[in-house]
């Protein structure tokens, strides 16, 4: 099996992902592998070789690059948190802050922003991945309430009155509570919406 | 040949203090992310601090953070580790690691032998 | 912290035999952008550091005998040694490099039955 350098009439190489045509040459050469870049190119009598990324750069694929990319912060102004650091095989990983959704995308996410509101009575549909798209307010479902504007509060189900030993004294709503009172007692007008003991 | 060979260890009391050395020799000390990876008696392997090969970048295991420092001096090729405030739980073999990386977060592809810390009065 | 879950603790396998080892993470160590999966394997004899067997996952080091193999993406991976040698006989950790700290599983021993 030939070893790189190689001739090649075709103009392919075998090995699509580790080497690459050198079309001067009319050579398959090899690529250098991820966290190094070329520091002398391929000839007929010798392969390519490979040198270390310098600090703050990388480079994430088998490649050519007689370069390597320059690891960049995430930028906080940006609505950007940092997941996971840069090296020099894989560039910085980045997020969008909590409570922001990614509003930009150039292949990442290059800009986030805040997340609706959902008003009461519903809440955000929860989503796959985190970040990737604005609140979309949905209902809350049978039984369940949620009473205040907020990107993140959830349904929560209606109090059972009978579980405390109380009686219902109004049903619960979408966008409130049950309210209980004690089974002797009537419930002022003043007091709709509160638990009375 | 690529070699990592650690010293200082030894037995030290509570509370004491030691410093770790790691001399590298064979590849471009400078060019490599360093870490420290110990392994008490019997027990699992667990990453201890890393720095990056300038010595720009450190980071440390939550048990060991404030009481543990790591550094390198790139012109004597020679990672150390200050351990200070020592416990019974960082009685271990402590290890010295290469990452294929300027970065600490990688694969480690040359280990040295080891050198033992024991922790007791 | 990614944890890393290693099983079974330990393994009894004929000469010749093959030998399963797993490793689950508690995270995806699957990084999209090159598709690779950023997850070791280290072979540890009694009495010595651990040795680099595998990186990215499935990528054989260099020198490594080619009956060690691994594969598995993102939260589940498996090392395979397709017929277990005496000089086999060690504890196998693997480990994970996609996040900060770096995490080991707890290891395996593998012994001849």
């Known amino acids: 099996q030939a070893v790189p350098p190689y001739a090649s009439e075709n103009q392919t190489c075998r090995d699509q992902e580790k080497e690459y045509y050198e079309p001067q040459h009319r050579i398959c050469c090899s690529r250098c592998p991820p966290g190094t870049y070329v520091s002398a190119k391929c000839s007929r009598i010798r392969d390519t070789v490979c040198a270390t990324c310098a600090e703050n750069s990388y480079n994430e694929h088998w490649n050519y690059l007689t370069i390597c990319q320059l690891c960049r912060p995430c930028d906080p102004v940006m609505g950007l948190e940092e997941i996971a650091p840069c090296t020099s095989k894989r560039k910085t990983q980045c997020r969008c802050q909590p409570g922001m959704f990614c509003a930009a995308w150039a292949l990442e996410c290059t800009h986030c922003e805040l997340l609706s509101d959902c008003p009461p009575g519903t809440e955000a549909e929860l989503k796959d991945e985190v970040g990737k798209g604005n609140n979309h307010c949905v209902p809350c479902k049978a039984g369940h309430f949620q009473n205040t504007s907020s990107p993140s509060a959830r349904c929560q189900p209606h109090t059972r009155c009978e579980n405390q030993g109380l009686v219902e004294a109004a049903p619960g709503t979408a966008q409130s509570d049950t309210t209980c009172k004690n089974p002797l007692e009537p419930l002022p007008p003043e007091m709709s919406g509160t638990m009375l003991m | 040949e690529v070699q990592l060979v650690e010293s200082g260890g030894g037995l030290v009391q509570p509370g004491g203090s030691l410093r770790l050395s790691c001399a590298a020799s064979?590849?471009?000390?400078?060019?490599?992310?360093m870490s420290w990876v110990r392994q008490a008696p019997g027990k699992c392997l667990e990453w201890v601090s890393g720095i990056s090969g300038s010595g720009g970048r450190t980071n440390y295991a939550d048990s060991v953070k404030g009481r543990f420092t790591i550094s390198r001096d790139n012109s004597k090729n020679t990672l150390y580790l200050q351990m200070n405030s020592l416990r019974a739980e960082d009685t271990a073999v402590y290890y010295c690691?290469?990452?294929?990386?300027?970065?600490?977060?990688?694969?480690?592809?040359?280990w040295g032998q080891g050198t033992m810390v024991t922790v007791s009065s | 912290d990614i944890v890393m879950t290693q099983s079974p603790d330990s393994l009894a396998v004929s000469l010749g035999e093959r030998a399963t080892i797993n490793c689950k993470s508690s995270q995806n160590v699957l990084y999209s952008s090159n598709n690779k999966n950023y997850l070791t394997w280290y072979q540890q004899k009694p009495g010595q550091p651990p040795k680099l067997l595998i990186y990215w996952a499935s990528t054989r080091e260099s020198g490594v005998p080619d009956r060690f193999s691994g594969s598995g993406s993102g939260t589940d991976f498996t090392l395979t040694i397709s017929s277990l040698q005496a000089e086999d006989v060690a504890v196998y950790y693997c480990?994970?490099?996609?996040?900060?700290?770096?995490?080991f599983g707890c290891g395996t021993k593998v012994e001849i039955k």
């Open positions: 064979g590849f471009t000390f400078s060019s490599y992310a």
């Open positions: 690691a290469k990452s294929d990386n300027w970065h600490y977060l990688d694969a480690f592809d040359i």
């Open positions: 480990q994970q490099y996609f996040n900060t700290p770096p995490t």
